[in-house]
């Protein structure tokens, strides 16, 4: 004969534990039913009556099977620098994450407590390490032969264009300007002479390796919510 199924509440056998979705009530000394997610215990069990559950009120939730007398409060509404990626329901808390261009400076169990704007690398500096959901941009000075003329949280240092004849040498914040020694067509007087690169610049997606003479990591700026440092701007 199969063993009889015990209905809650029941006294567990000595040394045994209560079943899944049950808990041992210390006062009643019985195995009693838990409440399902989205509910809480309105009345705890006794020796003869099982747990009475009730739905969580608005703006409160329980995510797990439980016997808590009160549902948990959903977190406060997402701030202007955040987006709500999960709404508050009876079964789950609200989750706020940082909007594009921001990163999480102070995380919580789920989502973000405090967002901060991604650091922008000023001209002469490029992105050494891009920002992530939880880390700030790291800027580095553009190495010889590379430049960045933007204030950006995404732009890297790009190589100077290679000229046959250099009109203006490039520096960390400006590209080289080339001079055409043999114009392909006559120019009207006073016309602006556009630079004529010998070869098109390759589109790098990562910072170019620095020459061995240039220091590398010593230029990396600190991560995290720090005051704007050299090479970054708070804008």
């Amino acid at each position: 004969l199969p063993a009889q199924v015990a209905f809650t509440p029941y006294a567990p056998e000595p040394g045994s534990t209560c079943r899944l979705r049950e808990y041992y009530d210390q006062t009643a000394q019985m195995c009693c039913s838990k409440c399902s997610p989205g509910q809480h215990a309105k009345v705890f069990c006794t020796k003869t009556s099982d747990t009475v559950c009730d739905s969580c009120e608005d703006s409160t939730y329980t995510q797990l099977w439980n016997w808590v007398p009160e549902c948990l409060s959903c977190g406060s509404r997402c701030s202007s620098d955040q987006v709500e990626t999960q709404a508050c329901t009876r079964e789950q808390n609200r989750i706020c994450t940082c909007r594009p261009g921001w990163y999480c400076a102070l995380s919580k169990q789920e989502g973000c407590r405090l967002c901060a704007p991604l650091r922008k690398c000023r001209p002469g500096f490029g992105v050494a390490r891009p920002g992530t959901e939880t880390s700030d941009v790291v800027c580095k000075p553009c190495a010889p032969g590379t430049f960045s003329n933007t204030t950006s949280s995404t732009d890297i240092c790009r190589p100077h264009q290679i000229c046959n004849v250099v009109a203006i040498p490039g520096n960390a914040s400006m590209d080289a300007v080339c001079t055409s020694t043999s114009p392909t067509r006559s120019m009207a007087p006073g016309a602006v002479h556009l630079p004529q690169p010998v070869s098109t610049r390759s589109q790098h997606t990562q910072p170019t390796p620095e020459p061995s003479t240039a220091p590398s990591t010593s230029f990396l700026l600190p991560m995290g919510p720090s005051p704007p440092a050299e090479g970054s701007t708070g804008d």
Epitope: A28, A41, V43, T46, S49, V52
Partner: antibody
Framework: QVTLKESGPALVKPTQTLTLTCTFS??????????VGWIRQPPGKALEWLAH???????FYNPSLKSQLTISKDTSKNQVVLTMTNMDPVDTATYYC???????????WGQGTTVTVSS | DVQMTQSPSSLSASVGDRVTITCKAS??????IAWYQQKPGKAPKLLIH???TLQPGIPSRFSGSGSGTDFTFTISSLQPEDIATYYC????????FGGGTKVEIK
């Protein structure tokens, strides 16, 4: 409005049995989750839980006083009765009845009744 | 039986002071603790249940915290009407009161 009121003798002799009645209004012991309990407080001392009874007639007693205590209810009269046998002068105290919620804390209390045990 | 050790047994503080009372349970009681205020000759009055849930009508200067075995009750700014004895009650395993804390004004 929830109210509770204790009644019983002000004086009992040692070895006698004390019978206290709690008469309440504003709730019913036929409602799931409702309970009534008894707590006492000797003069100048702390509160001590004695016993209580639930809507489904489940009863709980303070383990150190269990042999002396009996609790019962009369749902139709809105009353709970506590009897305590073999009274001793150390049982001199103010006795309170209180409503207990479904999640087990005392929320409403009676005004208390003072019981002196003396020969 | 769960024992509740409440401290201090008495304290004297000035109006506006922050007052803190602690209760320590002899075993884990989750968050099942309530706090009561009792004035001389009166019945206890429920202030807080489930560690930190304030009863309706109770001023927000009263608060509670803790879980497991260590619990704290705080009056953020003591008022003359707060002069009373305060008791903790554990209800995680039967029911046990703490020994009480008598709060007086300096």
């Amino acid at each position: 409005q929830v109210t509770l009121k204790e009644s019983g003798p002000a004086l009992v002799k040692p070895t006698q049995t004390l019978t206290l009645t709690c008469t309440f209004s504003g709730f019913s012991l036929s409602t799931s989750g409702m309970g009534v309990g008894w707590i006492r407080q000797p003069p100048g001392k702390a509160l001590e839980w004695l016993a209580h009874i639930w809507w489904d007639d489940d009863k709980f007693y303070n383990p150190s006083l269990k042999s002396q205590l009996t609790i019962s209810k009369d749902t139709s009269k809105n009353q709970v009765v506590l009897t305590m046998t073999n009274m001793d002068p150390v049982d001199t105290a103010t006795y309170y009845c209180a409503r207990i919620t479904g999640t087990r804390y005392f929320d409403y209390w009676g005004q208390g009744t003072t019981v002196t045990v003396s020969s | 039986d769960v024992q509740m050790t409440q401290s201090p047994s008495s304290l004297s503080a000035s109006v506006g002071d922050r007052v803190t009372i602690t209760c320590k349970a002899s075993q884990d009681i989750n968050k099942f603790i309530a706090w009561y205020q009792q004035k001389p000759g009166k019945a206890p009055k429920l202030l807080i249940h489930y560690t930190s849930t304030l009863q309706p009508g109770i001023p927000s200067r009263f608060s509670g915290s803790g879980s497991g075995t260590d619990f704290t009750f705080t009056i953020s700014s003591l008022q003359p009407e707060d002069i009373a004895t305060y008791y903790c009650l554990q209800y995680g395993n039967l029911w046990t009161f703490g020994g009480g804390t008598k709060v007086e004004i300096k």
